[in-house]
Interface confidence: low
């Protein structure tokens, strides 16, 4: 039996579900009574899940695995692993026995994004050029171990006196702490970049140190250069910071967040207290951090309509402002594939293959490919409809003349998340087979 699994490791986020794809080609007349399927850990041979004597024998792996019973007869022996943990990382072998026997191993690579680094400064007051300061960058609950890079305001690496430690917690997730000792110039921005090597995700924290009052007398307000990307339904932090002078108290602070284009008030702090949200009660400041110059805004349950630019106005004696962009995103669902006609197909027939993917944002890029990954640029019609929440449903239709056989793949790409959702259909001229669970590949 020829058993097929993906060449590349399956990358799964901690706490999410992962599909370990495995497929075989059932012969005509094949029935599930003939099938023996075993999933086991490659190294230890520990049983994970099995199918025998015509029925699912269930999970032997903490009740977190499942097969796809409706797809087994079509040759889909894939395994669903729920609530992925760091300890699941490794190789899983898929054994298929009908009359003959075949096996193949698929690797699971577990990952967890690192939190946005928190930055602390010691000493934090009365700084003068020439002082030595210790900047600590802390980022939490990532996997695997991070690469930590320090940069100056121009993005050039700071390779000086850096000490980085990484500690794993009980779940195997790492907390990273990196300390930079640096001699201050007239002023400077120090950024700590915590990189997840599997997700290719960079979490960045930065601190701007202005040892003496800015000669213009203006408040220097710092926001991230790049858009903040937030998933629909999650919370986002719009970072904004200023440098409080010695003796600064919150009674002196006026802080206003507003929509840059319409000037609509979002949130404010004045007269020594939080004046609250003026934006559907979905915003909050970080009150404990304001005195240290952290004027960031937390936006809860992000919606598509939130996308755009937010301005952070800070007034103490003087005044400063800066705008931060929020880019909203939502992943596209795994495409469902339909075929018309779906029976009695012969080479030379024209078929219509429809690929549908739902509830993504922003608009997707849709690409059709053949079995070799070459683009199919033929007769393709793609439409995208936004629902009431502004999320897009994508429908792409390919009309194609059949060869002897062929695989047709539809790739729905989210341009912001660099996330690809794959669906495919294999047409063999007589029986038609759908390949195993589509593979979501994340680019970062």
């Amino acid at each position: 039996v020829e058993v097929q699994v993906p060449e590349d490791p399956v990358v799964a986020l901690v706490g999410t579900d992962a599909t370990l794809r495995c497929s075989f080609l059932p012969e005509p007349g094949f029935s599930l009574a003939q099938l023996n399927l075993i999933w086991q850990l490659t190294d230890t041979k520990q049983l994970v899940h099995s199918f025998a004597e015509g029925r699912d024998q269930g999970s032997a792996y903490a009740n977190r695995t499942a097969l796809f019973p409706d797809l087994l007869a079509q040759g889909n022996a894939s395994l669903r692993l729920q609530r992925v943990r760091v300890a699941d990382e490794g190789s899983f072998t898929c054994f298929v026995s009908i009359r003959d026997f075949g096996s193949a191993a698929v690797s699971l690579q577990v990952a967890a994004p690192y939190s946005k680094p928190s930055m602390t400064l010691e000493p934090s007051k009365d700084l003068r050029p020439g002082d030595t300061v210790t900047i600590t960058c802390s980022s939490y609950r990532g996997y695997p171990e991070a690469e930590v890079l320090w940069q100056d305001g121009q993005g050039a690496p700071l390779t000086g006196n850096v000490t980085t430690s990484q500690m794993a917690n009980e779940q195997g997730l790492f907390d990273v702490r990196s300390v930079l000792r640096v001699v201050l110039g007239a002023n400077g921005t120090y950024s700590c970049l915590v990189r997840n090597p599997v997700l290719q995700q960079d979490a960045r924290g930065s601190v701007t140190i202005t040892p003496h009052r800015s000669p213009t007398g203006a408040v220097e307000v710092q926001v991230p250069e790049d858009p903040v990307v937030a998933l629909v339904g999650t919370d986002a932090t719009l970072c904004c910071s200023f440098s409080p002078e010695p003796g600064f108290s919150l009674a002196q602070l006026n802080l206003i967040w507003q929509l840059t284009d319409t000037k609509q008030l979002v949130h404010s702090f004045a007269e020594g207290r939080d004046q609250g949200s003026a934006y559907a009660n979905r915003t909050a400041l970080f009150p404990d951090l304001l005195a240290q110059g952290n004027a960031s805004l937390r936006l809860q349950r992000v919606r598509v309509a939130d996308e755009g630019s937010f301005t952070c106005f800070v007034s103490i004696r003087d005044f400063g402002s800066a705008a931060v962009s929020l880019q909203v995103a939502a992943p596209y669902s795994k495409p469902s594939m339909t075929l018309e006609p779906s029976k009695d197909l012969r080479p030379g027939d024209t078929v219509t293959i429809t690929c549908s993917s739902y509830r993504g944002y922003p608009e997707a890029e849709v690409l059709w490919q053949d079995g070799q990954g070459a683009p199919l640029t033929g007769n393709v019609t793609t439409s995208q409809m936004a629902n009431e929440q502004g999320l897009f449903d994508v429908r792409s239709v390919l009309r194609v003349v059949l060869g002897a056989n062929g695989t047709y793949s539809c790739l729905v790409r989210n341009p912001v998340l660099q996330q690809d959702a794959h669906g495919s259909v294999t047409i063999t001229g007589q029986p038609m087979t759908f390949p195993p669970e589509a593979h979501h590949h994340h680019h970062h």
């Epitope: 993005g155 962009s325 922003p362 912001v416």
Partner: antibody, heavy 120, light 107 residues
Framework: QVQLVQSGAEVKKPGASVKVSCKAS????????MQWVRQAPGQGLEWMGT????????RYTQKFKGRVTITADKSTSTAYMELSSLRSEDTAVYYC?????????????WGQGTTVTVSS | DIQMTQSPSSLSASVGDRVTITCRAS??????LNWYQQKPGKAPKLLIY???RLHSGVPSRFSGSGSGTDFTLTISSLQPEDIATYYC?????????FGGGTKLEIK
């Protein structure tokens, strides 16, 4: 599909200014940094500057600071590059290009290029 | 600014050959290295970003490798349509800078 369409060729005298446009379609214009890159005849590629149309934020390379202005019109999804005090060595093909997301400075979509000739 | 040096500046190879182009950065740029292909009279096209990631629609005969300051673009089996000039570009630090280009011709 994602496309950047640039304005047509220009012939200018030394000392004059030129303004090249780049109309974007097929994606969310305000979410991607837009670059301007030029290429003198028979030469390599040279990055001039970039704009984030979402809020108008710009970055310029030192060489062109003070002489180049990049702007964007969100209502028409169009970016503009204006170069002033033209000299003969500004004769080049000028390209707009979209920066890919995530935070990597690679340019995944390019305009077809606009030829600017500076000649007395 | 970071200087990018490509070599060779031109090279001639036969269809089916394995072709390698190198690019060196004047300072460490981690993996922030991209490759473009430009055919005469046309705009550049992105081939590879972040050292080794193939842009969508790019044939798998193209691959990239390297880290830090030294990088390589490889075409595993040269095809007639690969005749073009290839540029590397660093994206580690603003301003982004390009290599001088490598002109690839068929023998």
């Amino acid at each position: 599909q994602v496309q950047l369409v640039q304005s047509g060729a220009e012939v200018k005298k030394p000392g004059a200014s030129v303004k090249v446009s780049c109309k974007a379609s097929g994606y969310t214009f305000t979410s991607y940094w837009m670059q301007w890159v030029r290429q003198a005849p028979g030469q390599g590629l040279e990055w001039m500057g970039t704009i984030y149309p979402g809020d108008g934020d710009t970055r310029y390379t030192q060489k062109f600071k003070g002489r180049v202005t990049i702007t964007a019109d969100k209502s028409t999804s169009t970016a503009y590059m204006e170069l002033s005090s033209l000299r003969s060595e500004d004769t080049a093909v000028y390209y707009c290009a979209r920066r890919g997301i995530p935070r990597l400075w690679y340019f995944d979509v390019w305009g077809q290029g606009t030829t600017v000739t500076v000649s007395s | 600014d970071i200087q990018m040096t490509q070599s060779p500046s031109s090279l001639s190879a036969s269809v089916g050959d394995r072709v390698t182009i190198t690019c060196r950065a004047s300072q460490d740029i981690s993996n922030y290295l991209n490759w473009y292909q430009q055919k005469p009279g046309k705009a550049p096209k992105l081939l590879i970003y972040y050292t080794s990631r193939l842009h969508s629609g790019v044939p798998s005969r193209f691959s990239g490798s390297g880290s830090g300051t030294d990088f390589t673009l490889t075409i595993s089996s040269l095809q007639p349509e690969d005749i073009a000039t290839y540029y590397c570009q660093q994206g580690n630090t603003l301003p982004p800078t390009f290599g001088g280009g490598t002109k690839l011709e068929i023998k």
